[in-house]
């Protein structure tokens, strides 16, 4: 049309002396906020801070006490088949997805979804509900470990013998059990071990049931307070403090685990324990429960669907190659789980040999392993006090960094909702103190005499595999089918300089959702109401409370969809289209000018949006 004129203009341009354009407006740095906005988002001071924080966050108690037991229970080496299917099909893809969307959007666990797909920002809320509940009960384990640690500083471990005030006439020391024939004769009488009695009668002072909460255990309440204080001071300065604390908390447990591994492997009976741990039984793979265990273990052990990994990723520099590090961290995490099995089962093998019983009789999972089986094992070793102190310090450090990384994730997610309010002055620190205090007060219900029942209720329902699978499904669905896997790959390429192989993209689109739906359905089909110690049956009201805890997170997704659609006006399809479109995409923006006020609402492409706090915070 006007090619001639256009070419003439270009010729004139080339003839002229070419000068740089001066420009006038004050720019804003990539990470800076415009004047009057919240302070700029801090970043990890070095790559190692991030790597160690993630390592500390997901290498936790589950690696040591859950994976080895699941391996033994579900067919030994054969369990590695479903484990690796879930690892590569959902664990690593979701783990990387959470890190990368945090890094990409520079937002925490809620607001990142607000940016990616406002209609599904309930994913973020669901994650925060799960992590908030998790933070209340996970730390109770650390309170128990602290109590055991203090009790270990004695010449004689208090769970080694039966001569204590808390012991019953039925208490029988393990030296008696070495004689198998004597043990068989007397085992018809209900004899208990001093370790079990210490755990149930001293530590827990276990009441008859959840409807008998009893009194507060002040010693445990103080231990809980202590670990909450440590947790608070580890995160109160944000990633500046978290990033430095993990240098110790994330590395020291590995050294201790190595020491325990060497100790275990040099004990008599270790070989039998390891054989028991890994001997493959392929027939077990026919049981859906094995697959459910593999799936849920992956989700637990990678600390995904909690918003924590997204929050950690959000402090990365935009150009940081997190793909490479996520893969290495995955190897570290699963490797730690695998190696822990050797450390645990070598000691269980020794213990079984010492007692003259089958390994199946001593193999435990969860608190049973940490507070019954292992403490019992150390009483049979030379230098029991030393090994006990070492074990409980390792347990504490393993759990502590997982705890404070998850609290950091929770805090980041919430602070990012109200940045202009919560990032000013000391408000963030005050807010952290508030969250920690509330969580501590809720945790006190778990350090009463009936506290163990409350703890198990939270453990079984609040952060159950079902909740995590639900969140993971929606995360992958939104990224693959609404935001678009290719679009995210464009962003990843912009950040790390290349596109990862298609494996991730296909996992988000098909493999992970299929695995999640399958696992979710089987979990519901195979659901059995919670019991304690396979004997105590929870009352219906407690089961109802448990399901309320589970649904409190899961319902966030549909609930937010309904709320968002109600907040937006206009034709239904226009509303849906608008809410499926990414928001606030440019974190380098200096201003937001295009929103036109209309009837005290905002007009956006035919959709009227009522100004709620979320829309105001993330869009204006």
């Amino acid at each position: 049309m006007a090619t001639k004129e256009k070419l003439q203009c270009l010729k004139d341009f080339h003839k002229d002396i070419l000068k740089p354009s001066p420009g006038k407006s004050p720019g804003t740095r990539p990470e800076d906020e415009a004047e009057g906005k919240p302070p700029q988002r801090e970043k990890w001071s070095s790559k190692i801070d991030f790597v160690l924080s993630v390592a500390g966050g997901f290498v936790g108690l589950g690696n040591v006490w859950r994976f080895p037991y699941l391996c033994y229970k579900n067919g030994g080496g054969a369990f590695l088949i479903p484990y690796f299917i879930f690892l590569f099909g959902s664990g690593l893809p979701v783990f990387f997805l959470e890190i990368i969307i945090g890094q990409y959007t520079s937002e925490g666990g809620i607001t990142c979804w607000e940016k990616i797909c406002p209609l599904f920002s309930g994913i973020g809320y669901a994650s925060v509900v799960i992590v908030s509940l998790l933070n209340v009960y996970y730390i109770v384990i650390l309170a128990w470990a602290t109590y055991y640690l203090f009790q270990s500083f004695q010449k004689e471990l208090p769970w080694a013998h039966c001569n204590h005030s808390w012991n019953t006439p039925h208490c029988m020391e393990d030296t008696m059990r070495k004689n198998k024939s004597v043990w068989i004769t007397i085992s018809s009488t209900n004899f208990t071990s001093p370790v079990i009695e210490f755990w149930e009668r001293n530590v827990l002072s276990l009441s008859p049931g959840i409807d008998h909460p009893g009194s507060l255990k002040w010693d445990l309440a103080l231990c809980l307070l202590l670990v909450w204080l440590v947790c608070f001071f580890c995160i109160w300065k944000g990633v500046r403090s978290t990033g430095k604390v993990v240098y110790f908390t994330a590395t020291f447990p590995f050294a201790m685990l190595l020491v325990l591994l060497v100790r275990g492997l040099t004990l008599p009976g270790a070989g039998a324990g390891i054989k028991f741990y890994l001997y493959p039984d392929i027939t077990r793979l026919e049981d859906p429960q094995v697959w459910i265990d593999a799936g849920t273990q992956i989700f637990f052990s990678y600390a995904i669907c909690l918003g924590a990994m997204t929050s950690l990723g959000s402090y990365n520099k935009y150009k940081y190659n997190s793909y490479r590090d996520c893969m290495l961290l995955g190897c570290l995490n699963s490797g730690t789980s695998f190696v822990s099995g050797f450390a645990i089962f070598s000691i269980l093998g020794f213990m079984a040999q010492e007692q003259g019983v089958d390994i199946a009789d001593v193999a435990e999972s969860g608190p049973g392993l940490a507070f019954i089986a292992y403490p019992k094992a150390v009483t049979m070793m030379p230098l029991p006090t030393f090994w006990s102190i070492l074990f409980f310090i390792m347990l504490l450090l393993l759990g502590l960094d997982s705890q404070f990384v998850e609290v950091e994730g929770q805090i980041t997610s919430l602070v990012d909702l109200y940045p202009s309010f919560l990032r000013k002055g000391y408000r963030r620190e005050i807010f952290i103190a508030f969250v920690c205090s509330i969580s501590y007060l809720l945790g006190l219900t778990m350090v009463t005499e009936g506290g163990m029942y409350v703890f198990q209720l939270f453990d079984y329902y609040a952060a159950s595999g079902v909740c995590l699978l639900w969140v993971a499904f929606f995360e992958c669905f939104v990224i693959a089918w609404i935001y678009g896997g290719d679009n995210l790959y464009d962003g990843i390429e912009d950040m790390i300089g290349y596109r990862p192989g298609p494996w991730m993209k296909y996992s988000w689109a098909v493999i992970t959702p299929v695995l999640c739906v399958g696992c979710f359905i089987f979990s519901l089909v195979k659901y059995v109401p919670l019991t304690y110690n396979k004997t105590y049956v929870y009352p219906n009201w407690a089961i109802g409370l448990g399901w309320s805890l589970a649904l409190s997170s899961m319902l966030c997704v549909p609930l937010v969809i309904v709320i968002r659609l109600c907040q937006t006006e206009g034709p239904f399809l226009v509303r849906v289209k608008y809410l499926l479109t990414p928001r606030e995409p440019n974190r380098w923006a200096v201003e937001r000018e295009g929103a036109t006020p209309y009837n005290s609402r905002t007009v956006m492409n035919g959709a009227l949006v009522k100004p709620t706090h979320i829309i105001v915070e993330t869009m204006m």
Epitope: R29, D494, M495, E584, P585, A595, M619
Partner: antibody, heavy 122, light 107 residues
Framework: QVQLQQPGAEFVKPGTSVKLSCKAS?????RYWINWVKLRPGQGLEW???????????NYNEKFKSKATLTVDTFSSTAYMQLSSLASEDSGLYYC???????????????WGQGTLVTVSA | DIQMTQTTSSLSASLGDRVTINCRAS??????LNWYQQKPDGTVKLLIY???RLHSRVPSRFSGSGSGTDYSLTISNLEQEDIATYFC?????????FGGGTKLEIK
Amino acid sequence: QVQLQQPGAEFVKPGTSVKLSCKASGYNFTRYWINWVKLRPGQGLEWIGNIYPATNGINYNEKFKSKATLTVDTFSSTAYMQLSSLASEDSGLYYCARCKTMLSRCAWFPYWGQGTLVTVSA
Amino acid sequence: DIQMTQTTSSLSASLGDRVTINCRASQDISNYLNWYQQKPDGTVKLLIYDTSRLHSRVPSRFSGSGSGTDYSLTISNLEQEDIATYFCQQGNMLPWTFGGGTKLEIK
């Protein structure tokens, strides 16, 4: 494939205004920032501003704040830039350009329109 | 604003030559430097982004380097189709700013 179509030329009188269009195709229009860039002989390229069609989020270069107004029509997948109170120094070639990625940075432009030549003359 | 300076406004080279075009920023731009090619017919093409990353379908004879405030675009083996004007642009701080351009001609 991604295409940004601009009219070839606009002839306008000083003191009036002109509305330049940029019709997008081959992608989801609402999800990507549209940038406007001016080429003027002797001045090189100058970034005017950008707009995010989904929310009408806008960034302006302070220099062009009172000169340019960016808008979009999501239904026709068209971005517009209105230039007001035109003077001879507003003559030049105006390009629209699209960013590569949807979220985060919008600092480089792989997709460009052909440009509209604006001539301000009495 | 960050000022971008391309000291050479025009450059003559022979086909097959190795050509380097320089660009200087008024402050550190953390490698957020992009290069564009504007053909005589007005079409603009992205060549390199983030200092050294080659945009898709850009011939490998184009390469970018630099850090801090000094950056350069190199054409290793000049071809006829490379006759154009080359602009640098910083993507570190709003508003994005461009260099004045370097016009490349055949000797």
